[in-house]
């Protein structure tokens, strides 16, 4: 059983969203007492994989040499020290992209869009997808997260932004993936530029802030107002 | 009945390649880790190394890393183990042996019956 | 790597007798100490793992115990049957590594 020695952290290099046939590092890292390190892999029944610590013994290294679907979904690990078994690490949730085609991102009516108007993201794919995510760069997570009812696929995932702040502007992308799996999706849609004009009196400043900064409104998720689109997709926000 | 059959002897010259393999039966082959152990005729046993099925990860002992690959077909629920640049020093029976996690512990609970490997010219 | 010494390399005991062999490493394994039987021409066996815990389907006059680098395979009561070559196994660390095994005769 797992004794109370403190959980390890865990974590990927470059990051943990990576695209098809490039390399990734998984990381453990424990104490200077680890004699094993232990990862698992959701669903596994046996350890994914298992390593002697690296000296100074706190941390084992885990390498992925170019992903693939395989390797894509929701990891944990332990270490081993003299007095047993840690407790489990958080999940690290191993994203790939490239897994289909990548879809089409717009702006309707227009990426030039006037503050305090609103606009909507249309994600488009070729082929019939269940799972829309609409990301903005530099942002730490996923804006905006649709999934369709029931299994129903779709072509495409309307994202709408109503009133439009400063705020919103900036760069996006989308994705679409299958339901069956989380953890794959598609190549990244083209970037899209929205630009914010300002004729209404913004109620908050642009943020000026670089990636090592606290976060700031682009870090929060979008909450757009209006119905949900007809398009039979329910939205999560994470 | 949970089975690991391994090939046949082989004769092999010094300097050659060989490619042993267990046949694992009676089983989800990608749920249990595969072990590959060294017996020198009248001499103890040597660890080389393991195997994960069901994504191809390897832990070698350093002394074998050079000598011993380690592989799996998924679709025939077979483990390999191919010995390189042979000499007499391998001549051997090469045993595998899965390997059963009970919680956070582990044991070897099958073996394959081993294959004899002679190296000579 | 961590040597692992078994004792005695080989030996003679009567059918009935308690015998123990005892296998030391060279550093603290922590417990994870398996022992095996071997018999002519076959494949080993395994008795026991985490240094006391029976395999389903060994007798139980076989017994393990020991902790730290000293550890210990009771047999309570030979039987014929118990003839071959034991050897311990540490997969405490990388690489696992096998004690040079004891030879048990029957007298």
């Known amino acids: 059983q797992a004794g109370p020695l403190p959980k390890p952290t865990l974590w990927a290099e470059p990051g943990s969203v990576i695209s098809w046939g490039n390399s990734v590092t998984i990381w453990c890292q424990g104490t200077l007492e680890a004699r094993e390190y232990r990862l698992d892999k959701e669903e596994s029944p046996a350890p994914w994989d298992r390593q002697n610590p690296l000296e100074p013994k706190n941390k084992a290294r885990f390498s992925i040499p170019s992903m693939t679907e395989d390797y894509a979904g929701r990891y944990r690990c332990y270490y081993r020290s003299p007095v047993g078994w840690s407790q489990p690490s958080d999940p690290l949730e191993l994203v790939m992209t490239g897994a289909y085609s990548k879809p089409t991102l717009s702006a309707l009516p227009s990426p030039l869009v006037t503050s305090g108007k609103s606009v909507t993201l249309l994600c488009q794919s070729r082929s019939p997808m269940d799972t829309f995510l609409l990301i903005k760069e530099r942002a730490a997570h996923p804006l905006l997260h649709l999934r369709s009812e029931h299994g129903a696929q779709q072509h495409q995932a309307e994202f709408p932004m109503s009133p439009v702040t400063s705020v919103h502007g900036g760069t996006y992308r989308c994705f679409s993936s299958h339901g069956f799996s989380h953890y794959l999706l598609s190549h990244p849609s083209d970037p899209l530029e929205l630009i914010v004009s300002g004729s209404l009196e913004d109620p908050r400043p642009s943020p000026t802030r670089s990636v090592s900064t606290a976060a700031g409104p682009e870090d929060q998720p979008l909450m757009p107002t209006g119905s949900v689109p007809h398009s039979g997709l329910r939205r999560h926000w994470e | 009945e949970v089975q690991l059959q391994q090939s046949g002897t082989e004769l092999v010259k010094p300097g050659a390649s060989v490619k042993l393999s267990c046949k694992a039966s009676?089983?989800?082959?990608?749920?249990?880790?595969m072990h590959w152990v060294k017996q020198r005729p009248g001499q103890g046993l040597e660890w080389i190394g393991e195997?994960?099925?069901?994504?191809?990860?390897?832990n070698y002992n350093e002394k074998f890393k050079t000598k011993a690959t380690l592989t799996v077909d998924k679709s025939s629920s077979t483990a390999y183990m191919q010995l390189s640049s042979l000499t007499s020093e391998d001549s051997a029976v090469y045993y595998c042996?899965?390997?059963?996690?009970?919680?956070?512990?582990?044991?070897?609970?099958?073996w394959g019956a081993g294959t004899t490997v002679t190296v000579s010219s | 790597d961590i040597v692992l010494t078994q004792s005695p390399s080989s030996m003679y005991a009567s059918l009935g007798e308690r015998v123990t062999i005892t296998c030391k490493a060279s550093?603290?394994?922590?417990?994870?100490l398996s022992w095996f039987q071997q018999k002519p021409g076959k494949s080993p066996k395994t008795l026991i793992y985490?240094?006391?815990r029976l395999l389903d389907g060994v007798p139980s006059r076989f017994s393990g115990g020991g902790s730290g680098q000293d550890y210990s395979l009771t047999i309570s009561s030979l039987e014929h049957e118990d003839m071959g070559i034991y050897y311990c196994?540490?997969?405490?660390?990388?690489?696992?590594?096998f004690g040079g095994g004891t030879k048990l005769e029957i007298k």
């Open positions: 042996a899965r390997s059963t996690y009970y919680g956070y512990d582990w044991y070897f609970d099958v």
């Open positions: 009676g089983y989800t082959f990608t749920n249990y880790w």
């Open positions: 195997i994960n099925p069901s994504n191809g990860r390897t």
């Open positions: 550093q603290d394994i922590n417990s994870y």
């Open positions: 985490r240094a006391n």
């Open positions: 196994l540490q997969c405490d660390e990388f690489p696992h590594t």
